[in-house]
Interface confidence: medium
């Protein structure tokens, strides 16, 4: 019969012959022959292959270096790589998450619009009129100015984007 020019899914062409690919988690030891099946071996510890393959070497699991602020989000298996994420208070510097940086804090006059996650930084916004933030924080939103009226007081000092209003007693006219 004519030697094949293409092979089925999960097969590969070698020496005019279709051989079975190795399943995920295994590497190729020797190609099939007319008389023998493809020989595969499981990946070793800390190694993986995540596709049907003809690789002769497994890939090393990613190392989530704790000294770069990284930690293991999910341990690798023989079929999957380790997934790294950042420690609390840090976020990844890239999609591959190879290192982490400290979450940005919002300066006084700015509040947190969106709290940082393991993959995104803090998003800050300026405190609008009627709101303030007097701290540098990665968590705190802008706070509304105190309402002096509801406390039966009057504004003695106007608020800013960094300071609350100062309330004081009303000047009562003597009878």
């Amino acid at each position: 019969p004519e030697p094949p020019t293409a092979c089925r899914e999960k097969q590969y062409l070698i020496n005019s012959q279709c051989c079975s690919l190795c399943q995920p988690g295994q590497k190729l030891v020797s190609d099939c022959t007319e008389f023998t099946e493809t020989e595969c071996l499981p990946c070793g510890e800390s190694e993986f292959l995540d596709t049907w393959n003809r690789e002769t070497h497994c890939h090393q699991h990613k190392y989530c270096d704790p000294n770069l602020g990284l930690r293991v989000q999910q341990k690798g298996t023989s079929e999957t790589d380790t997934i790294c994420t950042c420690e609390e208070g840090w976020h990844c510097t890239s999609e591959a998450c190879e290192s982490c940086v400290l979450h940005r804090s919002c300066s006084p006059g700015f509040g947190v619009k969106q709290i940082a996650t393991g993959v995104s930084d803090t998003i800050c916004e300026p405190c609008p009129v009627g709101f303030f933030s007097n701290v540098s924080s990665a968590f705190e939103k802008c706070h509304p100015w105190t309402s002096c009226e509801t406390k039966d007081l009057v504004v003695q000092q106007a608020g800013t984007n960094k300071t609350d209003v100062v309330c004081g007693p009303q000047d009562r006219l003597r009878a």
Epitope: E45, S46, Y63, D65, P66, N67, L68, G69, R71, V72, Q74, K75, E87, E88
Partner: antibody, heavy 121, light 106 residues
Amino acid sequence: EVQLVESGGGLVQPGGSLRLSCAASGFTFSSYAMSWVRQAPGKGLEWVSTINAAGGGTYYADSVKGRFTISRDNSKNTLYLQMNSLRAEDTAVYYCAKEGGKYYYYAMDVWGQGTTVTVSS
Amino acid sequence: SYELTQPPSVSVSPGQTASITCSGDKLGDKYAAWYQQKPGQSPVLVIYQDSRRPSGIPERFSGSNSGNTATLTISGTQAMDEADYYCQAWASSTVVFGGGTKLTVL
């Protein structure tokens, strides 16, 4: 041969200071994070501090934060622990340990012989 | 703060299998290491990355880690294995040790 040798321990009064050193040899010191671990008499191991390979990242146990400072001099293959405001509860054998890095994930594969710190009046 | 809990002591007869446990919240999501410490000596790494043995550590030492528990197993325990054993893991940029387990070979 990979080796870590601590020095600088001794007797100090409460409130006093001490600087421990750890001389490393037999490996590329600048490529590995290093740690200090202590052991009070008759007690278990307690992690004190870790510094990353470049020296930029430092980590401390809550019990020593603000009092102890870890540092390293990669040109001298030496790790340091500056201990200030010492307390009686800091009395322990202090070990210097090498982080395993990519070879011994999340573990300390080489330890020094330890240096004894006694805080007493 | 993160805590690792070990039994204070474990006893085993020579030739038998000793198991020392270490428990912590979702410990299986972290990598556990184990150290052996004999009286007057520095700790020695016996298991890292849950189940791997450094070169020079006998095959009778093995480890596993899943769920909330890591386990150090010593099969065919010998008198020379009598020591304190400590588990260790990284958690939130800190290194955490278990309280230690004294292994007695009867």
